[in-house]
Interface confidence: low
């Protein structure tokens, strides 16, 4: 693996904890991931919906599986996208 690939990996894994944070400073990152999830039909970064912690309840449409062509799973009684976003984000960064 290249050094840049490793840095991207580490950065994304490190930022996973921001999804479950409740401070104002993390909101911008969370909102960016929400937009990305809707676009690429994925959920969370590493562990799926669980990455969002208690915030999962606070964003009503988070990860909601409306396109059943994509793999979905049940999480806290809701149907959510099964695939995590990390690989999509890495592909997106590589292409841009």
């Amino acid at each position: 693996k290249s050094k840049s690939d490793r840095i991207v990996n580490e950065t994304l894994y490190e930022n996973t904890k921001l999804l479950s944070a409740t401070g104002e400073s993390e909101k911008q990152f969370q909102e960016a991931i929400i937009v990305f999830q809707e676009e690429f039909k994925c959920c969370g970064l590493v562990n799926g919906a669980a990455d969002w912690g208690n915030n999962f309840q606070h964003y009503p449409e988070l990860c909601a599986c409306l396109d059943k062509q994509r793999p979905c799973q049940s999480y806290n009684g809701k149907q959510v996208y099964k695939e995590t976003c990390i690989s999509f984000i890495k592909d997106f960064l590589a292409k841009n």
């Epitope: 449409e61 909601a64 409306l66 059943k68 062509q69 009684g77 809701k78 149907q79």
Partner: antibody
Framework: QVQLVESGGGVVQPGGSLRLSCAAS????????MHWVRQAPGKGLEWVAV????????YYADSVKGRFTISRDNSKNTLYLQMNSLRAEDTAMYYC??????????????WGQGTLVTVSS | EIVMTQSPATLSVSPGERATLSCRAS??????LAWYQQKPGQAPRLLIY???TRATGFPARFSGSGSGTEFTLTISSLQSEDFAVYYC????????FGQGTKVEIK
């Protein structure tokens, strides 16, 4: 047996508001997603809105987005549709319907008998 | 939005004959398709879900088939109580209905 009984329909002027209710019985209401579907006189069925079992997710057809609000009161086993800025093209029979799944992403398995909404001056 | 197209709009059939109704999706909906029966003055009733699974209360003369974009509802031998309007609906991505097929007595 599953029963869905709509009420609140009637005649209203363009620009007016109306609130539809749907009383549910015969099943655990708080475990199911619920839809509103409408049917204009002599026309086909049009999906209007859906709400998750716990009220956390709500989705609307483009034709009603920003004007209609779906909500539910699980303690009262009741589904609601608040309809604002009504137009002539909203004239229809409005059906309350149950989704087969709690998160309201599957097929409709039970329907109410409907309540008629007429928008006319 | 996925557009559902049903054909024919009206089907004239004699009692005892076979009726074949078609439903086409503008993009794949896998097997996430339902059929509903609606009689005049009544609410629709779930007839078929998952493209081919018959709902409770409907006899074996009703059958559904297809997947992807092409679906068929077949009524093997029409009875008087089967004359109605039939709607297909996809629930693969949001929810959209076909315009309906009216099955009438010939």
């Amino acid at each position: 047996q599953v029963q869905l009984v709509e009420s609140g329909g009637g005649v209203v002027q363009p620009g007016g508001s109306l609130r539809l209710s749907c009383a549910a019985s015969g099943f655990i209401f708080s475990s199911y997603g619920m839809h509103w579907v409408r049917q204009a006189p002599g026309k086909g069925l049009e999906w209007v809105a859906v709400i998750w079992y716990d009220g956390s997710n709500k989705y609307y057809a483009d034709s009603v987005k920003g004007r209609f609000t779906i909500s539910r009161d699980n303690s009262k086993n009741t589904l609601y549709l608040q309809m604002n800025s009504l137009r002539a093209e909203d004239t229809a029979m409005y059906y309350c319907a149950r989704d087969h799944y709690g998160s309201g992403t599957y097929y409709i398995d039970y329907w109410g008998q409907g309540t008629l909404v007429t928008v006319s001056s | 939005e996925i557009v559902m197209t049903q054909s024919p709009a009206t089907l004239s059939v004699s009692p005892g004959e076979r009726a074949t109704l078609s439903c086409r999706a503008s993009q794949t909906v896998s097997s996430n398709l339902a059929w509903y029966q609606q009689k005049p003055g009544q609410a629709p009733r779930l007839l078929i879900y998952g493209a081919s699974t018959r709902a409770t209360g409907f006899p074996a003369r009703f059958s559904g088939s297809g997947s992807g974009t092409e679906f068929t509802l077949t009524i093997s031998s029409l009875q008087s109580e089967d004359f109605a309007v039939y709607y297909c609906q996809q629930y693969n991505n949001w929810w959209t209905f076909g315009q309906g097929t009216k099955v009438e007595i010939k």
